[in-house]
């Protein structure tokens, strides 16, 4: 502890200029004071001034007022410093002396004589308020006040608590009257050395080195570090923990970059045609009548569907067509006949059957012929039966579809998975991509088909901490660590939920 007992002398009265022994001072009592401060004694005794002692120069003659003086000789109030815990009790002896000698250092002069003395015993608490008192005897009167205050940086009821305000990286605080710390704005902790981060900053995923800051740990982002960073290269996916890539609906693949719903995302089929998804980036367009092409982008001639029957010839017009009918036929499509079976209207060996009591007829055609009069040879490719760009070929009475690579089925309607023939060696996992299959290899293998045995396994050095599982071939770093519960980080090196300002989690 450390403090100061302060004694303020205010007025001394010795009107008759008398000494304690009854003699008078000539020409007057040139007065100085001796002060002795010691531990509390019920009966004051001579002996060492255990709490300190001090003397003044000559302050006046006989009766005088003592002015405050802050420096030099004759300082008032008098200071009695101590370097211990203030006990709260004391004994004080104030003696007034007459000196015939030196004004400034009367203590050293011979022939000094006692004028009077007072003794005060009691309790005194530390505080700034002065206690005022006045002591009289038959000849003299002394007015004075006193107090105990703590030295700079000492606090508390007994001046025993040392506290120094500071504002550096070992603390940001001021001192309370009792010596406890009062943190400066933005700081907290026992020593006010922990910054208060931006309000809402995630406790585990963010930290700060100064107030109102939020610095994200690896794998996290956003103003409050509450958004995970997905796997590098993740295109159409999200994460709930860092480095994940959970695909959005309609997307697939390791990086969610394979379009499983090309029809919805890109609407490739034109002119009202129907789009059907068929694997990553695969689709087929089913055209409405009058359109053709991979995307049904080509408009057919209005006559392309051969609307004119019975040998009628078709002529395109701006938004429709016109049928020129052969003799014996009429109607928009030459569908009405003025002929009867008697006119032998059926060609190519077709059989004629009368209808409507002989007023019209119908031809039954032999195989490979069609039309109202069996006048057309059958072309089984006119309906564009082959999907996915397959080529249609007439083979006598039937037709076949010649499919493009990657498609099969009678109408080339089935997509062949590149992974169906298991191209990945050594237990690799196959992923269908637009440009062919891609293999994700198990630890110890690499290459496009996992056919190369790795002599240096990226997992062999044990890069993953805290019991994490190591996988190779999943990332550009050649390995990925799958963390156990309670650990995070690219190598699972950071435990979750360390002290408030711990730097890491994944």
């Amino acid at each position: 502890g450390s403090g100061i007992f302060q004694l303020r002398l205010q007025e001394f009265v010795n009107q008759r200029g008398m000494l304690a022994n009854g003699q008078s001072c000539e020409p007057g009592c040139r007065t100085f004071f001796r002060i002795c401060l010691k531990h509390f004694q019920a009966t004051f005794s001579e002996g060492p001034c255990t709490f300190g002692n001090v003397s003044t120069p000559v302050l006046g003659t006989n009766s005088f007022v003592v002015r405050d003086k802050n420096s030099g000789s004759g300082r008032n109030p008098l200071q009695l410093p101590f370097n211990f815990t203030w006990p709260g009790t004391f004994s004080l002896n104030i003696q007034a002396w007459h000196t015939p000698g030196d004004d400034l250092r009367p203590e050293t002069s011979p022939g000094n004589s006692l004028i009077s003395q007072i003794i005060i015993q009691g309790s005194l608490a530390v505080g700034k308020i002065w206690r005022t008192d006045e002591q009289n005897d038959t000849l003299t009167r002394l007015s004075y006040s006193y107090r105990v205050i703590c030295s700079d940086n000492y606090y508390g009821e007994s001046c025993s608590r040392l506290c120094k305000k500071r504002d550096d990286h070992f603390g940001h605080y001021e001192c309370q009257p009792d010596g406890s710390l009062s943190c400066l704005p933005g700081w907290t902790g026992k020593y006010c050395d922990q910054p208060i981060c931006l309000s809402g900053c995630h406790e585990q995923n963010g930290y700060c080195s100064k107030p109102d800051e939020c610095i994200c740990r690896p794998g996290w982002q956003g103003r409050l570090c509450n958004e995970c960073i997905p796997h590098n290269g993740c295109r159409h996916g999200t994460c709930s923990i860092p480095w994940q890539c959970a695909c959005d609906e309609g997307w697939g693949g390791l990086f969610c970059d394979q379009d499983l719903n090309y029809c919805t995302h890109h609407s490739p089929c034109k002119n009202g045609s129907t789009c059907s998804n068929s694997g990553p980036k695969g689709y087929t367009c089913t055209c409405l009548p009058g359109y053709t092409g991979e995307h049904c982008e080509l408009g057919l001639s209005k006559c392309a569907s051969n609307p004119c029957r019975n040998g009628g010839s078709c002529k395109d017009q701006e938004n429709s067509y016109h049928c020129l009918c052969p003799p014996g036929y009429y109607g928009q499509h030459c569908e009405h006949s003025t002929l009867t079976c008697a006119d032998s209207p059926c060609f190519n060996g077709g059989s004629c059957r009368e209808r409507n009591q002989g007023s019209s007829y119908a031809c039954e055609c032999p195989p490979n012929f069609t039309g109202s009069n069996c006048e057309k040879k059958v072309d089984r490719c006119t309906s564009n039966p082959c999907a996915n760009g397959g080529q249609c070929q007439n083979r006598g009475p039937s037709r076949t579809c010649r499919c493009r690579p990657g498609f099969t089925g009678t109408h080339c309607e089935l997509h062949i998975s590149d992974c169906a023939r298991s191209p990945c060696a050594h237990g690799g996992t196959c992923h269908d991509l637009e440009n062919g299959p891609v293999c994700t290899c198990p630890a110890g293998f690499s290459g496009r088909r996992c056919e190369v045995r790795i002599t240096h396994d990226a997992c062999a050095s044990g890069p993953c901490f805290n019991g994490a599982t190591c996988y190779t071939g999943l990332s550009p770093n050649n390995f990925v660590c799958n963390c156990p519960y309670g650990f995070v980080g690219s190598r699972c090196e950071f435990p979750v939920g360390l002290p408030p300002s711990f730097p890491w989690v994944a």
């Epitope: 940086n153 040392l162 990286h169 922990q194």
Partner: antibody
Framework: EVQLQESGPGLVKPSETLSLTCTVS??????????WGWIRQPPGKGLEWIGD???????YYNPSLKSRVTISVDTSKNQFSLKLSSVTAADTAVYYC?????????????WGQGTLVTVSS | SYELTQPPSVSVSPGQTASITCSGQ??????ASWYQQKPGQSPVLVIY???KRPSGIPERFSGSNSGDTATLTISGTQPMDEADYYC?????????FGYGTKVTVL
């Protein structure tokens, strides 16, 4: 009981970069109660504080060396490091790593044994 | 920049009291630490926060700090106390060491 061990080359050529690492054992570098620092002592001379670092990466440097000093921390390895660039013969010294304790008002009760680095061609 | 000044040397007879001073502008408003360093050894903290002793440091080591001066006192000095002593303080975020005082036990 926490122990500190300095490591790094004992000889560095002038104008090159001095690199030292301090490995912490017997305790975590990620404690919120400590700063981890470097102090040097040229032969026959006094101690000079170089700088210190908190486990989060906050650094504090001696203004007279600031332009040449970098201190970094690797919590996964329980290590912190010192890099001093463009060295001259005046940088020849015993380099100590130390732990400064917040509860000791910034006093350091744990020091490494020191490593002598000589700058000479 | 902030400086701490110490006397280069102090001599003391065994059993006597050695006082080492450390002066700096308003040093009393900062916490002072004291380190003992023997030849070929790392420094050892003997006083922190002006007057507190770490565990294991003998009671004969004491410290005070007020005004512009911090003082390390070794009472009943022993031959084993012969060493270099450094005061240290923090000026904002910068660590500052005194120049050191060599204590010789005669």
């Amino acid at each position: 009981e926490v122990q500190l061990q300095e490591s790094g080359p004992g000889l560095v050529k002038p104008s090159e970069t001095l690199s030292l690492t301090c490995t912490v054992s017997g305790g975590s570098i990620s404690s919120s109660s400590y700063y981890w620092g470097w102090i040097r002592q040229p032969p026959g001379k006094g101690l000079e504080w170089i700088g210190d670092i908190y486990y989060t990466g906050s650094t504090y440097y001696n203004p007279s060396l600031k332009s040449r000093v970098t201190i970094s921390v690797d919590t996964s390895k329980n290590q912190f490091s010192l890099k001093l660039s463009s060295v001259t013969a005046a940088d020849t010294a015993v380099y100590y790593c130390a732990r400064f304790d917040v509860s000791l008002g910034g006093g350091s009760d744990t020091w490494g044994q020191g490593t002598l680095v000589t700058v000479s061609s | 920049s902030y400086e701490l000044t110490q006397p280069p040397s102090v001599s003391v007879s065994p059993g006597q009291t050695a006082s080492i001073t450390c002066s700096g502008q308003r040093l009393g408003d900062k916490y002072a630490s004291w380190y003992q360093q023997k030849p070929g050894q790392s420094p050892v903290l003997v006083i922190y926060e002006d007057s507190k002793r770490p565990s294991g440091i003998p009671e004969r080591f004491s410290g005070s700090n007020s005004g512009d001066t911090a003082t390390l006192t070794i009472s009943g000095t022993q031959p084993m106390d012969e060493a270099d002593y450094y005061c240290q303080a923090w000026d904002r975020d910068t660590g500052v060491f005194g120049y050191g005082t060599k204590v010789t036990v005669l």
